[in-house]
Interface confidence: low
């Protein structure tokens, strides 16, 4: 057995470009030829332990054999040269690992960033995968000095080992090298100060102003390389519950600053702020956003009076009436602060006024049958709203003028109400509504609409398949006008139960059927029509359709002395429901008739 290899494969470390051809040779040593009684024609080539077809092999001379591979695609192949010693025993001569891949692409999109307080980081696009060990080296130099090379661990970025020097241009490029080639990116030339990403501003604080309820003052601390850089800011804000940010115009924050007053805000509203910074020239990178900070604008007096209405309770005596004044709490956007109380002033004709301070949203007063004017204002710690004024006429005055063409219809899960205004100028409209039920009283909700409105939706939480009684009242300077009402459904359904039919009168050949209207709680919609199905035990079923205004119907052409089964169904726009089955028998003879 020879200790030295019997021969060698050349090249010893083959690296092939994918898709190309490759030839290797195996050269046997003279001593080997004599020891094993062989020559190059005894050589067997193998890839990954599988014999290479003979057509790929060429015997060059007695010591040398070559093998050629076309269109190499496997990333790694174990290539061995073997001999058939003494004509039959296979002996390994030498082996190499053949690698395939691509030369590096020219790196592109080279960019660098100097994160404040850290060294410079450069990134690039290395291009296609090489499938080979490829070294990427970030090179950098001044016009007069070379900096240490940066060997990339990942092949797409490298952080240099030296601290950046500002206000001196640096040239940077990337060299990529593997066994198949070496290539360099385009170089980029820049001043590192123009690539700075500052640390985020910090200690952001927000303060409000008693004088102006529409502003908040911000202050913060900027780093900017310890004051070496002038930074401009980007400020964004949102209300506490909003998800989208509002941008302060960048032109307002272009000059270096550490404070700013945000204007045009809503009173008594909590806002959240964040801020970031960049070099004032706009070169470099925006910092990350600062930690968020919040503040609440100062209160302002309520921006409008509450919605205001009244109800007169039935009066037992003739001289007085009980009047319940009612109003709605202002939404936060109009209250502009915490409402402390409401001021109600009642004036009888032009005589003495009575003032009430109320913390709730209603006030019941006993009034004579004279005409009164009521005014209502909401108060917070800054001041009072404008007053809502309501005339309460004498009960002897008949209300004139009401809305016309009143309609209601569901759309987009809302119940809409529409009307034509009366011919006289209106101050406002009051809409009232309640669920009609035979099991519970009609508990009214209400809302106020401006004089210009003639279409709106009910703003309460409405239920499906409930019948709503809706009333619209125009309000004039002299008092309320006439009220118009209608019924409507947010969404109809099939009735909860069908009608229970009975016989009112049965004759030899006809029967009068009667039924009660389905209670409003079970109707679930507008009853449009009924169907009556009737049959004998052996005959086919007959069906008649009856208008919903009827509560009885006469079946004719019946057979005498016959048992009939009857059932009724009621239909809304959304479907029908059967009532219970009822049976009756026609007599054998008509009244006074003898067999």
């Amino acid at each position: 057995q020879l200790l030295e290899p019997c021969g060698y494969i050349y090249p010893e470390f083959p690296v092939v470009q994918r898709g190309s051809n490759f030839t290797a040779i195996c050269v046997l040593k003279e001593a080997c030829l004599q020891h094993y009684y062989v020559n190059a024609s005894y050589i067997v080539w193998k890839t990954n332990h599988a014999a290479v077809p003979r057509e790929q092999v060429t015997v060059i001379n007695r010591t040398t054999s070559s093998v050629t591979f076309t269109d190499v695609v496997l990333p790694s192949v174990q290539l061995t040269c073997n001999i058939l010693s003494f004509g039959q025993i296979e002996q390994n001569v030498y082996g190499v690992t053949m690698l395939s891949g691509f030369p590096p692409d020219k790196p592109t999109n080279l960019t660098c960033i100097v994160n404040e307080g850290k060294n410079m980081l450069c990134q690039w696009d290395p291009g296609r995968e090489t499938y080979l060990e490829t070294n990427y080296t970030l090179k950098s130099e001044w016009a007069t000095e070379k900096f240490p090379d940066c060997q990339s661990k990942h092949g797409t970025s490298c952080m240099v080992s030296y601290m950046p020097t500002y206000y001196v241009n640096i040239e940077v490029w990337v060299e990529a090298e593997n066994a198949l080639g070496k290539v360099s990116s385009e170089s980029i030339n820049f001043d590192p100060v123009d690539k700075v990403k500052p640390t985020p501003p910090y200690n952001l604080s927000v303060t409000n102003s008693e004088e102006l309820s529409s502003i908040l003052k911000l202050s913060w601390v900027s780093s900017g390389l310890g004051g070496l850089l002038d930074l401009k800011s980007d400020i964004q804000y949102r209300t506490k519950d909003a998800s989208t940010w509002i941008q302060v115009p960048l032109e307002d924050t272009m000059s270096p600053r550490t404070s700013f007053t945000v204007q045009d805000l809503k009173p008594f509203t909590e806002y959240v702020f964040r801020i970031r910074s960049i070099k004032d020239s706009g070169k470099g990178y925006w910092s990350d956003w600062s930690e968020e900070a919040s503040g609440t604008t100062y209160e302002d007096r309520p921006s409008r009076p509450p919605s205001f209405w009244y109800k007169t309770n039935p009066s037992h005596g003739q001289e007085y009436r009980s009047v319940r004044l009612i109003w709605k709490a202002l939404p936060l956007s109009e209250a502009n602060g915490k409402i402390l109380d409401y001021e109600v002033i009642l004036t009888q004709s032009k005589s003495v006024s009575q003032t009430y301070t109320v913390t709730g949203t209603e006030l019941t007063v006993n009034l004579t049958n004279d005409r009164y004017v009521a005014s209502l204002a909401a108060r917070n710690k800054v001041g009072k709203s404008a007053a809502a004024v309501l005339t309460i006429p004498s009960p002897h005055v008949t209300a004139a003028y009401s809305v016309v063409n009143l309609k209601a219809f569901p759309k987009d899960n809302l119940l809409w109400v529409e009307w034509t205004p009366p011919p006289k100028p209106v101050s406002k409209y009051i809409l009232e509504w309640c669920v009609l039920s035979e099991n519970a009283p009609c508990v009214e909700d209400w809302q106020q609409e401006d004089a210009t409105v003639n279409r709106t939706h009910l703003r309460g939480r409405l239920l499906e398949s409930k019948c709503y009684q809706i009333t619209v009242t125009p309000v004039f300077a002299t008092g309320p006008g006439g009220s118009e009402s209608l019924k409507a459904y947010l969404k109809q359904a099939a009735p909860a139960r069908g009608p229970t039919v009975r016989t009112k009168k049965v004759g030899k050949n006809e029967a009068v059927l009667a039924w009660d209207q389905i209670p409003v709680d079970d109707q679930n919609g507008f009853i449009r029509n009924y169907s009556i199905s009737y049959r004998t035990s052996v005959g086919k079923e007959m069906v008649v359709h009856v208008d919903s205004s009827h509560t009885e119907y006469t079946l004719s052409s019946l057979s005498s002395d016959t048992l009939y089964m009857v059932r009724m169904a009621a239909y809304t726009d959304e479907g029908g429901k059967d009532g219970p089955e009822f049976t009756f028998t026609t007599p054998k003879f008509a009244q006074g008739e003898i067999e």
């Epitope: 090179k139 070379k146 170089s187």
Partner: nanobody, 125 residues
Framework: QVQLQESGGGSVQAGGSLRLSCVIS????????MGWFRQVPGKEREGVAA????????VYADSVKGRFTISQDSSKNTVYLEMNGLKLEDTGMYYC??????????????????WGQGTQVTVSS
């Protein structure tokens, strides 16, 4: 084996002229970028001029613009540097360099792999 051989250096009076030559051998001349660089003792080697042998594009350092001209003769695999209006500060060792790895003309010395031995230029008053 890539080889670069400079010639044409020498001594000259301020305001005079010289023509440096650089002959390249050992690789395909067509795919090459050629540059002239100079070095004064105690200072970094600086780029003077460069040319793309394929397209003929050129670039010059600001200090030599209008005075120096880089050119080529591809039939002789040679690059020239014509130096007119020489100044005292033009004194130094002039090197010819070649690059096969770049794709645009540059006088960035870090992108050139192959260098000649240099030729001395001395400008006196």
């Amino acid at each position: 084996q890539v080889q670069l051989q400079e010639s044409g250096g020498g001594s000259v009076q301020a305001g005079g002229s010289l023509r440096l030559s650089c002959v390249i051998s050992g690789f395909t001349y067509k795919q090459t970028f050629m540059g002239w660089f100079r070095q004064v003792p105690g200072k970094e080697r600086e780029g003077v001029a460069a040319i793309s042998t394929g397209g003929g594009n050129t670039v010059y350092a600001d200090s030599v613009k209008g005075r120096f001209t880089i050119s080529q003769d591809s039939s002789k695999n040679t690059v020239y540097l014509e130096m007119n209006g020489l100044k005292l500060e033009d004194t130094g060792m002039y090197y010819c360099a070649a690059s096969t790895v770049i794709t645009s003309v540059t006088v960035n010395r870090g992108l050139y792999q192959y260098w000649g031995q240099g030729t001395q230029v001395t400008v006196s008053s």
